[in-house]
Every structure is written in C-alpha cells, then in structure tokens.
C-alpha cells in the first residue's frame, strides 16, 4: 500500500494568534465618526471626529490638520466661531453625530450634539496628495429657526444618520434621527427629513418635508437608525424599533425604509420588515420552525457581489446586495445558536417586495383589513385610504402616502451559524476578483476577513487577527480608502488592506498556495509570505 503524507487538519494549517501590525492613528479620544475622501487626482484624506475635535489625516494616517469643534461657548472652538459672536446656546461638549461628504462641492459636513445640532460645512482644498479643510461655514441662520420649526437643527444627541444626494444643482440631505420627548421639544429635529442645502451655505431651506414620531408615542416608541445608503433611485435607512406601537416596546425588529432619491418628497416613503434567521442544517428538538429569529440589526453594508455569491443568491454578478449582521436582542447576549448571524438581501428583491406591497394596498381588489401601518408617524388607516381618512377623495392617490409593506423579507444566516461566539460589531463587504469578502470587526477588537459563501460547513478566512492589545470593540462605521479599509477601535483608527494584512497565518505550504490569488501569498523557505517579505526564493507554483 502506497505511503501518503498525513493530512493536516484544516484548522491546524493556520494560526490566528500571529501578530500583524497595521498602520494606525491615535485620535486622542474615543472615535465618534470617520469618513474618507478620494479626489479626482490622487489626493485623499481621512476625517476623524472625537469629542470637541476633528482630525484631518493624509492617506498615510499622518495628521494634516486638527480643528477644535467644541466645547460650545469656549473661545478656542474654531467651528463655533463661524456662527459669529455668541452665545448661541448652552455651553457644552460637542460630540460629533454626523460626518458626511457633500461630493458636489466637494465639502465635509459635520454636525454635533451642541448648538441645537447645527452643522458646519468645510470646503475641501487639495494640496498635493493631501486635503485641507477651508474655514468652516456655519449652516445656521438664526432668523429662520425657532424651537418648533428649525430647518438648521439636524443632529440629535441620540443619534443621526445622513446620506447626501445631488439633485440638479442642489445637495439634499436625507436625515434620520432618534428622538425622545426631551429631544423633540428642543429645536424639533424630525425622525426622517429631506433638507436642501442653500446655495450660499447659510443653512438649509425652510419648508422641508419630514416625518416624526407622534408626540403620544415619543416616550415608548424609539427608533434607532443603524445605517443609511444611496443606491439607484432610492435612499435607504435601516432601523431597529419596537415591532408594534401597542405591544411590548422591548420586542424589537429591523426595518428598511425607502425614500426616493430623485424627488425630495416623502409621499412614497415605504418600510419593509427584514427578517434574519439562523436555520441549522439539523434542527434541534424544540427549535422554532423556519429557524431561530435574529431580529435586531447590529451593522449593515451594501455592496455589489462577486460571481460565486451571486450564483448562490440567484442574482447577476455585480448586483447590489444589502448585508446585515443580526443578533437576538439589544444586548446581543448568548442564547442557543451563534451570537451573530449575517443575512443578505438583494436590493432588487427588496424593491420588488416593496412595489408588490404598494400594489396590494392600492390596486383593487384591496384585501379587507389591510392596514397602511406606520401608526407611530401617522394616523391609523386601512388601505387604500390615506392616513386618518375613511376613504380616498377623487384628487388623492393611495400611492402618495407613507406605507408599511404588509409582508416581511426573510433570509437565513449565510454563515450557517459558524460565527459561533463571535460578536460582530462592524461590517464592510468588498468584491475581490470574483470573490465576495466580508470584513468584520468584533467586540474584542479583532478583524475577520471571510469569504461570503453559503455552501460550506467551515469559514473561508482571508484573515483573523487582533488590531492591537487594547481589545476594545471595533466601532460600527467602516470607511474605504483605495485598497484599504479604516476601522476604529477605542481612540485608534487602523488601516487594514482589503486583501488581508499578510500571509504568515497560513502555516503549511499547501494551505499557503491555496490562498486566494488577490492575497499574493507564496511559500518562502519555511513560511508563507508576500513577495516583498521574501528576500530569497518565493514560490507560488508548487511546494518543496
């Protein structure tokens, strides 16, 4: 009988304790927001906000500029000064709640928890490969704003998500804010609004469209806006909120809200419940039919998918898919099954489901008892009637009012529970060659880069490494700059190559040479490495 090499178990062919050091920046305080900019030439920047300060970094994560954004009322606050001599409100620290790019100008817009949640606009001025912030413009016109009607009050201290869309020659800010009774009473931010930036950068145009949680529900019904993005003809917000206005407010679920990106109006505002489940291949006795629900979205990202995953999802390569990491409850604590699951929702399918829901509500024959929903935003009504009305009047259209689609969109965990005890806190998805890779940050400060495939009973790791020694959670928002992703953990920003930090965690030559082509791994004497790490022979074709 022929002798054969003993088979190395898959798990023994890699070592996730291998230390990788990636470039980092110490921000001097807990990172609150981060955004990246890449210009037409090779100028680029990373903007990092901490309490009372905004850092501008070059592509090498070296500091280019640093601006004091607070405390409000402090003479050293460089942004506050843009609003003219104060006082403009109660003194206090500025926590950055919004940090977004307006690509049309281009400009950076930052909005904080102080000064009624107003925003500041900084034109981006390139200088070589770096980018600088011009002097800030205060997006607040005192004479246009009142506590009950404040177009320039954008950020809520409880959290705000913003997506900027260019329409014609104007920039529209799609804003979603978490509210409670106290916040709603102070300069009235809205739950969802679309605001046009005035051409003279003096603030936002009055008379903007908005939806808000009705005063009677503000105490018990809170909406957390987890993510927002723009793709195709729509802007989407992802929320975690109570499943019902009337039932237990701690029974949460996840919704997708869709707004038109081409018309700045809210008549076609639609919501759809997203249902993500863990359905083990062998169902335990007593486990729920259809799988265990994971109703609470923790993080999300949308991206076009590679060929392999596209085939598994029965969609075309390059189509946009919304990926979400879900947990069982707010604390994300352990139950039966994994701590985190990942579900994939193709955007075209989401749109189709929403459109079908509108047809069910508005096209006769309408199913009796079908509710328009969104009772926290509007008066209850049955389809096809407008909110609060018993019937449609001849000059109104059923379609011109917000609607909760009556069916939900259900998906199962792409990783088949294989994330196990890992608590995922950050997610960014990229397409590399024909492979779709999920770049995930974890509660204990690690980065997992894993191929997104369904059909396996093990995870295909590009990498799994610790960002540093602090072990602090990786924060929700991830940004891309060129071929790198920027993750924040504690007071640090880390720059992680999308093709992985290296190859040293592959321990055997066989495993090394089976690594994805984009990783650039080869066998180097007695270790797996990239060509630049190998002064001697470097072999990508065969093992010694």
């Amino acid at each position: 009988e022929d002798w054969q090499c003993p088979r190395t178990p898959y798990a023994a062919s890699r070592d996730f304790d291998v230390k990788y050091v990636v470039p980092s920046f110490s921000a001097g305080g807990l990172v609150q927001a981060m955004v990246t900019y890449e210009g037409d030439r090779n100028e680029s920047a990373v903007f990092v906000a901490i309490r009372n300060r905004l850092h501008v970094l070059g592509p090498d994560l070296k500091s280019v500029q640093s601006l004091a954004t607070g405390p409000a009322g402090d003479p050293g606050c460089q942004t506050c000064a843009a609003c003219g001599p104060g006082p403009h409100g109660p003194p206090g620290d500025t926590d950055t709640k919004v940090l977004v790019l307006d690509p049309a100008l281009p400009a950076l817009v930052s909005c904080g928890s102080s000064l009624q949640g107003r925003c500041f606009l900084h034109d981006l001025e390139p200088q070589g490969t770096a980018v600088h912030l011009a002097a800030p413009a205060c997006l607040f016109s005192a004479h246009h704003n009142r506590p009950d009607d404040c177009p320039d009050c954008v950020a809520s201290p409880l959290g705000t998500r913003v997506t900027v869309v260019e329409q014609g020659q104007a920039s529209y800010f799609y804003v979603a804010s978490s509210l409670d009774a106290a916040v709603a009473a102070s300069f009235s931010p809205r739950s969802v609004s679309i605001r046009r930036l005035k051409a003279d950068a003096s603030g936002f145009a009055p008379g903007f469209v908005a939806l808000s949680v009705l005063p009677k529900h503000l105490v018990s019904y809170s909406i957390e806006y987890v993510h927002s993005f723009h793709t195709g003809a729509f802007v989407y917000f992802l929320t975690v909120q109570p499943a019902s206005v009337t039932d237990d407010p701690s029974a949460l679920h996840t919704r997708l809200a869709r707004l038109s990106a081409t018309e700045p109006e809210l008549g076609d505002y639609r919501e759809l419940v997203l249902d993500c489940r863990f359905a083990p291949k062998r169902r335990r006795r007593g486990a729920p039919e259809g799988g265990q629900p994971y109703p609470v979205l923790r993080v999300a990202h949308s991206a076009p998918v590679g060929a392999q995953l596209a085939t598994e999802l029965s969609i075309a390569e390059g189509q946009e898919v919304l990926f979400g990491v879900f947990v069982t409850g707010k604390d994300g604590g352990p139950g039966v099954g994994p701590n985190s699951v990942v579900c994939a929702f193709p955007i075209d399918l989401l749109d189709t489901l929403i459109d079908e829901g509108v047809e069910r509500c508005c096209e006769s024959p309408v199913h009796p008892g079908l509710r328009r929903g969104l009772d926290f935003f509007q008066s209850p009504s049955f389809c096809p009637n407008p909110p609060g009305l018993e019937a449609l009047s001849p000059n109104t259209s059923c379609r011109h009012f917000p609607l909760l689609v009556s069916s939900s969109f259900s998906r199962v965990d792409l990783f088949n529970g294989l994330l196990g005890p890992v608590q995922v806190t950050a997610l960014y998805v990229t397409r590399l060659d024909n492979v779709t890779v999920a770049h995930m940050g974890t509660m204990d400060g690690r980065i997992l880069q894993v191929e997104l495939v369904r059909s396996l009973n093990y995870l295909l790791y590009v990498s799994n490494f610790s960002l540093g020694d602090s072990g602090q959670p990786v924060q929700r928002d991830v940004s891309r700059l060129g071929d790198h992703l920027l993750f924040a953990s504690g007071d640090q920003v880390f720059q992680v190559p999308i093709q992985g930090p290296g190859c040293r965690h592959f321990l055997t030559c066989g495993r090394c040479l089976r690594a994805w082509h984009f990783m650039g791994c080869g066998w180097c004497g007695n270790m797996c490495g990239q060509q630049k790490e190998c002064p001697g022979s470097w072999q990508q074709d065969h093992c010694p």
């Epitope: 210009g39 030439r41 003219g84 390139p126 200088q127 002097a135 413009a137």
Partner: antibody, heavy 121, light 107 residues
Framework: EVQLVQSGAEVKKPGATVKISCKVS????????MNWVQQAPGKGLEWIGR????????RYNEKFRDRVTITADTSTDTAYMELSSLRSEDTAVYYC??????????????WGQGTTVTVSS | DIQMTQSPSSLSASVGDRVTITCLAS??????LAWYQQKPGKAPKLLIY???SLADGVPSRFSGSGSGTDFTLTISSLQPEDFATYYC?????????FGGGTKVEIK
C-alpha cells in the same frame, strides 16, 4: 528655491484683452492653488481669483467674474490670467501668488514679480 | 464680502521704535488672517499667517495677535529695512480681501 516668474509689461487699448503668464519652478504647479491679485497705481491689493491646476477648479471675485479667466498649463508649469473688455481702471500691476496651507491655515506664501498692464487709447 | 479696515493708513516712526498696526474684520474670521509687507516696486512678502504664526525667514521682531475680528501686527524694534507698506488679509471666505494698507515712513 520656489520662484514665480511673470510675463512682461503690456500696453492695451480699451476693449482689448490681455493674457498674463506665470511660470513656476521648484515645485509642481498641480500641487497648490494659484491666485491672481490686482494693485492699481497708489492703491491697495485686490484678490481676483484662483485656480487649482490639479483639477482646473476656479473661484473668482464677483467683481471680476464676467471678464476674467484663469487657466493653467501643467505641461509647462504655467498659470495664466486673461482679462477682457479692458478699461482704463484696469491699469494696474497684476501679481500671481501661490497659496499654501500651513497646518490649519492658508496664506499666500510666494509671489510673482508683477506684470504692469496699461490701458490707454 | 468681508471688509478689512486697517489703521492707521500711515505712520511715521524712528529706528528702534515699537510700532503697532491694527486690522478690523467686518465679521468674525477666527484666526484666518495673514500680514504682508510690500516695498515700492516689489511684490508683497508674507510675514504672518494664522494671525500669530511667523512665516519662514521673518525676523522675530515681527509678531501678530488677535482673533475673531480684531488683529494687531507689532514690530518690537523698527529697523531701517522695515520701512514699507503693510497689508492684512482675511482668508476666511472668498473673495479673500485685504486691508487698505499702512505705510510706515521714517520720521
């Protein structure tokens, strides 16, 4: 040493157009904004506008907007300012000046020697 | 546009004197202010940026102060080569605007 060298003096008739050049050396034109400044005889300085040669993005003073065009030729590291529909009050010295960020703040750190434009019938 | 008002428009001083020139902005400009020196027939030269920072190669007898709307250029001990015209400039908003200038003459 960074240098900005401007073209020579010009005499023009009212209604004509003048185009002044500013050739830079010892730095890359595309890396910094280039500004143009007017100084009428015995008067102060007035900012006309600027260009970022890397992207050709321009910004003008409203006072000059209808008559001025600022351009750059990156192949020759030269910036240009063209002023049309000349009138006698355009008689002045015109300077090109590079602006650069120093930390958080910007300033015009290098200037050309100036070009005298005389408008006379 | 932001107006920059410089005063005095001219002053006479002797070598060794302490000279102060002020500049008032019509609205707050933080510290987005520069000072330039111009000699007859020459281009302006940058002295101070960010209201208080000395440009490379500028003698330490020059200093700048102020923020918001009120700014000052001080020459602690006037030297013969300092007789010139001085301009402030705001770089907070375009159009960038200059003060009217202060001519420092020999007494």
């Amino acid at each position: 040493e960074v240098q900005l060298v401007q073209s020579g003096a010009e005499v023009k008739k009212p209604g004509a157009t003048v185009k002044i050049s500013c050739k830079v050396s010892d730095y890359t034109l595309t890396d910094f904004y280039m500004n143009w400044v007017q100084q009428a005889p015995g008067k102060g300085l007035e900012w006309i506008g600027r260009i970022y040669p890397g992207t050709d993005k321009t910004r003008y003073n409203e006072k000059f907007r209808d008559r001025v065009t600022i351009t750059a030729d990156t192949s020759t590291d030269t910036a240009y300012m063209e002023l049309s529909s000349l009138r006698s009050e355009d008689t002045a010295v015109y300077y090109c000046a590079r602006s650069a960020y120093y930390g958080n703040y910007v300033a015009m750190d290098y200037w050309g020697q100036g070009t005298t434009v005389t408008v006379s019938s | 546009d932001i107006q920059m008002t410089q005063s005095p428009s001219s002053l006479s001083a002797s070598v060794g004197d302490r000279v102060t020139i002020t500049c008032l902005a019509s609205q707050t400009i933080g510290t987005w202010l520069a000072w330039y020196q111009q000699k007859p027939g020459k281009a302006p030269k940058l002295l101070i940026y960010a209201a208080t920072s000395l440009a490379d190669g500028v003698p330490s007898r020059f200093s700048g102060s102020g923020s918001g709307t009120d700014f000052t250029l001080t020459i602690s001990s006037l030297q013969p080569e300092d007789f010139a015209t001085y301009y402030c400039q705001q770089l907070y908003n375009t159009p960038w605007t200059f003060g009217g200038g202060t001519k420092v003459e020999i007494k």
